[in-house]
């Protein structure tokens, strides 16, 4: 996988005024790494493994130029001119990636209440819209404001593609994300399902990177994708990674039962606990596109586009 | 590819014990279970146990508990099954078999043969 | 213990022909059946399972079918190398159980 770096930026309005603070979340190889939100942006790093290596001067950067950034991005939504009542948000993505082979890819996403209208390539300065005419309409709209705008000529791009790029080659050199293996804890608990039924769940939880192989197996035989539950695998704010799968089985089966974890070429088999049942009130509870974010999204119901 | 080799033939006497080893290669032997099944001279095929390389945990059919012990040695990528007190009733081809996590038995080894007499 | 019945323990057969094994569960197994070949060697091949899945390797003359408690396993144009003992198993319940075998012999 290429290395990238990921600016999620987020500005909302109400009844025709742009909000004055912003939402953003910096993903650093798929990573949430830094954050700044409301009114005051202040560049947080995502977990103490971004703060243990980075230090104060990072985050002042980052803070100036997501401020910045974020300021930009009210404007653009001022100049939306098909705002009706209620709230909207205007939501921008940029990434750029660095691939083994040393080559670059850098591109801006914009969403209007969560829906993409615009894409650029930030290296062939191409852009692109989807089909639909609400989506080219917003689309021809922010695409004439942002040629309007004197910053945002050819250079600007070309140092947006540029910074961000350096940006990523700094936190690559600095060693916060050298190529590291964390290996995940494994649990198995159970619960009572119903009469003669139980549930078993096998969580895995702080591994790196996020791929991971996770499914129970009867005897030794993997069971059906049918028979068994996923969870996302999820950030658990450490900079490492959770998920879980869940079977239901018959009581005094147990035995038979093993959940398969296999994970940066290494792996491992862990058998049900057996004695007395034990209730679990719930899985883990987690909100697929808020991934812990402001709790403005969650009660606006806003969408956040991974 | 996957292959399982097992130890050769055992003549041994009624009381004694015996164990049959069972070596795995061409793949990673603690990923997937080894099972071992009986076959009695002319007769057809009986499930023994099975146990997992990576934990050693076993489950046994309730007929040879008692009779076969299953164990393994990682770092052989060998597999062993224990024969205790043995009499006439426990000679066979006994043989291993692994899987590909898909079906079971997927791999056999080639058996081997236990004779018990005086 | 589940029993796996085997009625016919041989057959003889021509090269060429389609031949039929069948095997019967005492209770119903939900589809954990699978076949196996064992050679006069004494080497064993598994090649059904999941009643109807052929594993990698085996020739698509072997098919398999059936639920509940009956099933077969069908070698639809008979090879002189298919000259074997044939054994059902199902895996649904333990402990593991296997039938009695079908002989198959050439006429």
């Known amino acids: 996988e290429p290395h990238s770096l990921r600016y999620n930026l987020t500005v909302l309005s109400g009844d025709g005024s742009v909000q004055s603070g912003f939402l953003a979340e910096v993903h650093l190889d798929g990573q949430p790494f830094l954050r700044c939100d409301r009114q005051k942006c202040r560049a947080k790093p995502q977990g103490q493994w971004a703060e243990d290596v980075l230090g104060n001067k990072t985050w002042d950067r980052e803070t100036r130029d997501l401020t910045g950034n974020g300021k930009d991005l009210r404007m653009t939504l001022a100049h939306i001119k098909d705002q009706k009542e209620g709230l909207h948000s205007l939501q921008e993505i940029r990434v750029c990636e660095i691939h083994e082979d040393n080559s670059t890819r850098s591109s801006q996403h914009f969403y209007y209440d969560g829906e993409l209208f615009l894409s650029q390539n930030l290296e062939t300065e191409e852009w692109t819209m989807p089909q639909s005419s609400r989506a080219q309409t917003l689309a021809m709209n922010v695409r004439n404001f942002l040629k309007e705008d004197a910053m945002k000529t050819k250079t600007h791009y070309h140092a947006m593609h540029a910074d961000c790029l350096q940006e990523l080659r700094r936190y690559l050199k600095s060693g916060v994300v050298l190529r590291r293996t964390v290996p995940p804890m494994v649990n198995v608990t159970r619960s009572e399902a119903s009469e003669g039924n139980i549930t078993v769940t096998c969580r895995a939880s702080g591994f790196y990177p996020w791929n991971i192989t996770l499914s129970w197996r009867q005897d030794g035989v993997s069971l059906s994708h049918d028979t068994q539950q996923w969870g996302d695998v999820l950030p658990d704010g450490n900079g490492t990674y959770q998920t879980w799968v869940a079977t239901r089985i018959c009581q005094g089966e147990e035995q038979r039962f093993t959940c398969y974890m296999e994970h940066s070429g290494n792996h491992s088999t862990h058998p049900v606990p057996s004695g007395k049942v034990l209730v679990l009130q719930s899985h883990w509870q987690h909100h697929h596109h808020h991934h812990g974010l402001n709790d403005i999204f969650e009660a606006q119901k806003i969408e956040w586009h991974e | 590819q996957v292959q399982l080799q097992q130890s050769g033939p055992e003549l041994v006497k009624p009381g004694a014990s015996v164990k049959v080893s069972c070596k795995a290669s061409?793949?990673?032997?603690?990923?997937?279970?080894i099972y071992w099944v009986k076959q009695s001279h002319g007769k057809s095929l009986e499930w023994i146990g099975y146990i997992d390389p990576y934990n050693g945990g076993t489950v046994y059919n309730q007929k040879f508990k008692g009779k076969a012990t299953l164990t393994v040695d990682k770092s052989s990528s060998t597999a062993y099954m224990h024969l205790n007190s043995l009499t006439s009733e426990d000679s066979a081809v006994y043989y291993c078999a692994t899987t590909d996590g898909y079906s079971l038995f997927t791999y056999w080894g080639q058996g081997t043969l236990v004779t018990v007499s005086a | 213990d589940i029993q796996m019945t085997q009625t016919t323990s041989s057959l003889s057969a021509s090269l060429g022909d389609r031949v039929t094994i069948s095997c019967r569960a005492s209770q119903d197994i939900s589809n954990y059946l699978n076949w196996y070949q064992q050679k006069p060697d004494g080497t064993v091949k598994l090649l059904i399972y999941y009643t109807s899945r052929l594993h990698s390797g085996v020739p698509s003359r072997f098919s398999g079918s059936g639920s509940g408690t009956d099933y077969s396993l069908t070698i639809s144009n008979l090879e002189q190398e298919d000259i074997a003992t044939y054994f059902c198993q199902q895996g649904n319940t333990l402990p593991f159980t296997f039938g009695s075998g079908t002989k198959l012999e050439i006429k």
């Open positions: 061409g793949y990673a032997f603690t990923k997937y279970n």
